[in-house]
Every structure is written in C-alpha cells, then in structure tokens.
C-alpha cells in the first residue's frame, strides 16, 4: 500500500487563458489522478464568479446542460467514459465574457475539486505609422504618429529617436465594444537637421509575439540653406577655368539658382551653369565677391563669396584649376 | 427524510449465494453513492464495496472481487449486494450506507438498519 | 493491508471535553485520507458525523469537530451531553479502499 496522502487527485488548468473577440477558445481543465487512486467523477462543473448557477454541467447520466447551448460545448467530455477532461469551448467571444471561471470535479470519494481560470479576452490591434510633415515652426509640434487601432487591452507604445523630442500618447474608444485605440504623436522643433531622418514606433501588444516597430522617415520643410564652395583661396592667373559651385539643402527641392556679383550682373568671365558658376581664365587680377540666390518653395536664400585671382608663378601653385 | 430500508435476515448453506436489497426513499436515487460495509460478530467494521446508482459503476474491495457483485435498479431506487460462494466466515451483519456531499465533501451520511446473514450448514 | 487503531474506550463527564484520535499503521494520516467519523448508538442505526476530515455533517451538532492531531485524525466533542454516549468509528481512505477503525467506546458519565 502506498503511505497515506500521497495520492491526491489534482485539478489542473493553466491560471490564465488569452482568447481573441469574435473567435472561440477553450478553458483546458483535467483532473489528475494518480496511477493507485481510485476516484469517481459524476459531475463536471463550470461557473463564473459573480453569478448565481453554473453555465456547464456535464452528469454522468445525464449529459451536458449549458445556459447559452449555442456558445458552449465541453470539449471531450462524453457519456459512458471515465469524466477526465472538463475542457469547455467558447465561441464568439465577447468582452463581457472575460473574467474568472471555476472548473469543478465532483468525485467520490475524494470530494469535489475546482480550480480557477482568467480569462483574458483579446483584440489585436492594427497599427500604423505616418509622418507629419512641417515647416519650421521654432517650436515643439508633432513629426510623426503612430496608431494602434482597436486593442484588446490598449496597446504601449514608444519611440526610438536619436533626435532628442517626446511622446505625446492619449486613448480612445475603439471601433469594437471593448477595444481602444492608442494614438501616439513625436513632438520635437522642426530643424533642417531633423528632415529625412527616422524615428521609430514600437507597439506591444500581448496577442503579438513580438513588438512591431515601424519606422517613419521625417519631412521638414524649410527655405534653402546655401553655401558656396570650389574656392580654396589659390587662384591665379593664366591658369585652366574654374568651377564655384553653389550647394543648397532645402525641402522641397530648390526650383532655381541665380548667380550675381555684389556689383550687379556676372563679369564676362563667369558663366552660370545651374548650380554651378565657370570662371574663365583672366589675365589680370581680380577681386570679385559673387551671390548665389537659391529658391525653393518657402523662399528664396543666398551665399556670398568673395574670389581673389592673384599673380604668381602658375607652376608653383594649383592656380585656377579646381578639377 | 432520507431512509435506506434493508431486506430481512438471511440463513444459507456454505458455497449458496445470498442477495441483499436496499431501498432507498426520500432523494435521487441515480446521483448518488452506496456503500456496502459488513460487521461479523465480535469483529470491527469491513467495507465491501460501492457503487454509483446512476451507472452501476463500482469500484470492488480486492478482497471481495469475483465473489461480489453490486448492482442496483433505478425504477425501484434499490440497490444490491450479491455474494457468492459463501463461507462460514461470511456469517456478519450487512449495512448498506449512502454518501451524502457536506459541502465539498462525501461522508458516510445515512444507514441501513442492516442485514443479518448467517452461514452454517 | 492498512491497520487503523483507536482508542478502544474513552470517558468525558457531562459538559467536558473529549479527543478520540485515529492512527494509521502506514503512516501520518493526511486530508488525502478524508477522514470520516461516524456515530452509533445502542439499538440505533449508524449516523454520520464528518466527512473529509473536517465537514461535519447536515444536521450535526457544532459541539463534534473533524481535525488532524499531529498524525493522526481526530474527532473532538467539546461540552458532552449524555445523550453522545455511543460507539465513535473512523474510516480512512486508502487509494481504492476504505478501512474502519475498530471503534471508540464513549461513556459519558
């Protein structure tokens, strides 16, 4: 004989289980009895916290008996076999069904033995990332957001940025009973730093398996910033041309370059190309301070750079020559 | 109220079967358990058997296996206990006893009066 | 074969107090036993008292409690009344089996 106590009969169950709305799951519950335990199950028995009666019995003579027959069924539970596994399925999930269930075996002798399960009822969500395009602003104004549409419990969200800015996160009512919809902003001061970067939005959720990160490349309009470059302040005469050329950072894209001098229209010797001004060779020095006007759709700016071609021994030196 | 009503006293022969009813009156017959249990004279208590009305399944001391059979008849709510190949050590008096649930819990709830059997040739 | 003892006689005055304990010869006994006690007068039927170690039963006065004593299971009545005087029997569970003890001789005198 095995020593007394050793032979219990266990319910088991998981003490939490995740169903999605709309769909159907099942509440697992099996009594373990022991290889030398005799035990006798006459009734199965599911009921919710809360509420007066059961919602499922499954008798020994008799059968299954459920409040709402059409969105219950005991799993296995069958009449003429050993009453092992009350498992019972749910269908058509609906928020109100989430909550705590009691799973009971009565057995004989051993008496009755429940066990409790929490049922989570879920709903993943859909998300979705989209810039927000600006101008500079000069102060904090959303750049992104990130929407996660419909969760079952709401979504989390945060941002990953390199960029410095904060979160801005604020709920909703879903589509869905039940649901919420989570939307979340990137705040930050627009600057022409910031335009064609990313910053990335990371959603969890407890029906993913992992947290889904969606990245969103920023825009930020801003008038042109303009420099000139090609000029390394060697430049002499009787050598090869030269080319000056005007660089420009903007959003959108500039729509014109115009080349100048502080003394009005370009000396002969300079020829503007686009973005680019030829400088021709010369055969006396010079002192000229040139203009590049850039235009975009916010606006028009500009660069100045002043170019000096001095006499000297071409050989010596690069000359004119900027290839 | 709740009554298990035995059958009277039996006298057999060594190797001769006897059969004991009990009748159950005042709850569901089918959802409930009964136990067999024997008293021989000047020895304590030894339980035979049980059965669940509703099915007939049993579950048999070893001692008393292939000798013993319980049954029992739903229409009449009565529940039976066959022994064959009786011997004198057979001779006890035979209780049948219902389990009754005390919340979560079965216990020996309600008695029969008791059956006399006396084995002698 | 399991072996359940108890204490052959007991006496408790009227009013008092009064353990009568159940050893098993295989060991402590434990709620997997669901201990049982039941009750029998002279020329009456038997009655039970406590089922799974501690639930008295429907009907059952509050003076009878179900325990576990150490190792063994117990049956307390506290404030005797003379009309207690009866045979006190525990049955222990045993797997697929239960066993009697051979009883407890209660006198209340």
């Known amino acids: 004989w095995p020593p007394p106590g050793t032979g219990d009969i266990v319910v088991q169950a998981p003490t939490q289980v995740p169903g999605f709305l709309g769909d159907s799951v099942t509440l697992p519950c099996y009594l373990q009895v022991p290889g030398m335990e005799e035990t006798h199950v006459s009734q199965l028995t599911w009921s919710r916290h809360g509420e007066s009666g059961s919602m499922a019995v499954f008798h020994q003579t008799q059968g299954p008996n459920y409040s709402e027959p059409k969105r219950l069924e005991f799993v296995a539970a069958r009449l003429g076999t050993e009453l092992r596994d009350a498992s019972l399925r749910m269908f058509g999930l609906r928020v109100e069904d989430e909550g705590n269930y009691t799973c009971l075996f009565v057995a004989f002798p051993q008496g009755s033995r429940s066990v409790d399960i929490w049922l989570r009822v879920l709903a993943k969500p859909q998300n979705t990332a989209e810039v927000q395009k600006v101008q500079l602003t000069g102060k904090p104004v959303p750049v992104a957001r990130c929407v996660s549409t419909g969760g079952r419990p709401p979504a989390h969200i945060t941002w990953h940025s390199d960029l410095g800015g904060m979160p801005n996160t604020s709920q909703a009512p879903g589509f869905l009973s039940g649901t919420v919809t989570v939307t979340s902003l990137w705040i930050l001061v627009p600057s022409s730093q910031v335009d064609g970067k990313s910053v990335t939005c990371k959603v969890e959720h407890e029906s993913f398996e992992k947290p889904q990160l969606l990245t969103v490349n920023l825009t930020v309009y801003y008038p042109p910033e303009v420099s000139i470059s090609g000029y390394d302040n060697n430049w002499y005469l009787s050598q090869n041309e030269a080319t000056l050329t005007c660089d420009a950072r903007s959003n959108p894209e500039p729509t014109g370059y115009n080349w100048s001098t502080t003394m009005g229209p370009l000396p002969p010797f300079a020829v503007a190309q686009g973005a680019q001004l030829l400088i021709r060779p010369v055969d006396k020095p010079i002192n000229t301070t040139f203009i590049c006007n850039v235009t975009n759709a916010l606006g028009a700016r500009q660069a100045e750079l002043t170019v000096q071609v001095k006499e000297g021994p071409p050989s010596e030196h690069s000359g004119m020559s900027s290839n | 109220q709740v009554q298990l009503v035995q059958s009277g006293a039996e006298v057999k022969k060594p190797g001769a079967s006897v059969k004991v009813s009990c009748k159950a009156s005042?709850?569901?017959?089918?959802?409930?358990?009964i136990s067999w249990v024997r008293q021989a004279p000047g020895q304590g208590l030894e339980w035979i058997a049980w059965?669940?009305?509703?099915?007939?399944?049993?579950n048999y001391n070893q001692k008393f296996t292939g000798r013993v059979t319980m049954t029992t008849d739903t229409s009449t709510s009565t529940a039976y206990m066959e022994l064959r190949s009786l011997r004198s050590d057979d001779t006890a008096v035979y209780y049948c006893?219902?389990?009754?649930?005390?919340?979560?819990?079965?216990?020996?709830?309600?008695w029969g009066q008791g059956t006399t059997v006396t084995v002698s040739s | 074969q399991a072996v359940v003892t108890q204490e052959p006689s007991l006496t408790v005055s009227p009013g008092g107090t009064v353990t009568l304990t159940c050893r098993s010869s295989?060991?402590?006994?434990?709620?997997?036993?669901?201990a049982n006690w039941v009750q029998q007068k002279p020329g009456q039927a038997f009655r039970g008292l406590i089922g799974?170690?501690?639930n008295r039963g429907p009907g059952v006065p509050a003076r009878f409690s179900g325990s576990l004593l150490g190792d063994k299971a117990a049956l307390t009545l506290s404030g005797a009344q003379p009309e207690d005087e009866a045979e006190y029997y525990c049955?222990?569970?045993?797997?697929?089996?239960?066993?009697f003890g051979g009883g407890t001789k209660l006198t209340v005198l």
């Open positions: 059965i669940y009305a509703g099915t007939g399944d049993t």
């Open positions: 799974g170690t501690n």
């Open positions: 006893a219902r389990h009754g649930l005390t919340g979560r819990h079965w216990y020996f709830a309600v």
């Open positions: 295989t060991g402590a006994v434990t709620t997997s036993n669901i």
């Open positions: 049955i222990l569970w045993y797997s697929n089996k239960f066993v």
């Open positions: 005042g709850y569901t017959f089918t959802s409930s358990y």
